[in-house]
């Protein structure tokens, strides 16, 4: 196949994917904040979105994907499908995905979704900065 296996993409292609993800993530977060005003960020949810074993840090797609699959029915499915499609390209092939359950309580659920979206946006910003701070 012409395409390199998805877990073997060079920094240039990772950067392309991050550039595609940023406006999707930002738009999703802004729309959610407008729709759900007054919802606080949860201090019980931590999205481990960066790998600790690589330099510069890599987006930990396998850790992020289950969260987006979990919140998909409760948010903008169209945008979330696009985010999942991009994250799939960054996923290491044999990395297992854990099951994530969304809080049953409505208010906690909204707080959980907001936290995921905020942490993911911050995470993309961090990875993008690290990709740009190389010898370019």
């Amino acid at each position: 196949s012409h395409m390199a296996p998805t877990h073997q993409l060079p920094p240039s292609d990772v950067r392309k994917i991050i550039l595609e993800l940023q406006p999707l993530s930002r738009g999703l977060l802004e729309d959610y904040q407008k729709k759900e005003t007054g919802v606080p960020e949860s201090n019980r949810t931590l999205l481990l979105c960066l790998t600790s074993d690589s330099q510069p840090p890599r987006l930990n797609s396998s850790a992020i994907l289950p969260y987006f699959r979990a919140i998909r029915p409760l948010s903008d499915k169209n945008i979330i499908d696009k985010i999942i499609e991009q994250l799939d390209k960054l996923k290491f092939q044999h990395e297992p995905e854990t099951e994530i359950s969304v809080p049953a309580d409505t208010f906690e659920c909204k707080s959980f979704i907001l936290t995921i979206l905020q942490q993911f946006s911050a995470c993309l910003e961090s990875v993008f900065k690290s990709l740009n701070s190389g010898p370019q």
Epitope: H2, A4, T6, H7, Q8, S12, D13, K16, E20, P135
Partner: antibody, heavy 118, light 111 residues
Amino acid sequence: EVQLVESGPSLVKPGGSLRLTCSVTGDSITSGYWNWIRKFPGNKLEYMGYISYSGITDYNPSLKSRITISRDTSKNQYYLQLNSVTTEDTATYYCARYGNYGYAMDYWGQGTLVTVSS
Amino acid sequence: DIVMTQSPASLSVSLGQRATISCRASESVDTYGNSFMHWYQQKPGQSPKLLIYRASNLESGIPARFGGSGSGTDFTLTIDPVQADDVATYYCQQSYEDPWTFGGGTKLEIK
């Protein structure tokens, strides 16, 4: 068969703007990445930037303040605009497709020579 | 930016002989066993044509006389045997890191 054809003015005055069109047939610009590259008279090739299937753009930092790549999906065309041109921008300009991650630029236009001169 | 250094700048080879072109990157262009180095051929008055992608993969429709090898920072394009139709300038290009960069080109002539 994928075909790319560049068009635009062959002569631009210093300080002016260069605007080129790349017309694509055989593939849709709403998939893949669509690039501009130029070749200077001494044969040096320079990568300029791209517009993606979703309309995201990214540019070579050496040109960032002067370059804009845009598109018209209804015409299946994408464009290069380079502002504040000097004689140093005299080159043959190519458009090219980057179809798959981890691959290479597999289809190129024939190129169009742009001379910057008063 | 990754600097690509090609050598020689020009090469004169007899028909039927082997031509070898080298390309050196200022830093490694490898990720997980893949080298993001590509080779193009540009004939006079034509656009560049992809010959080899990811260091050693022959692009569809390119004759098997063309071959690519190398990893890390050092790469080689080999044409064996050289034919009259191979008169062109050959360029290496890295897509490992932005901005993508090209070698200065090697002009192949027939002796």
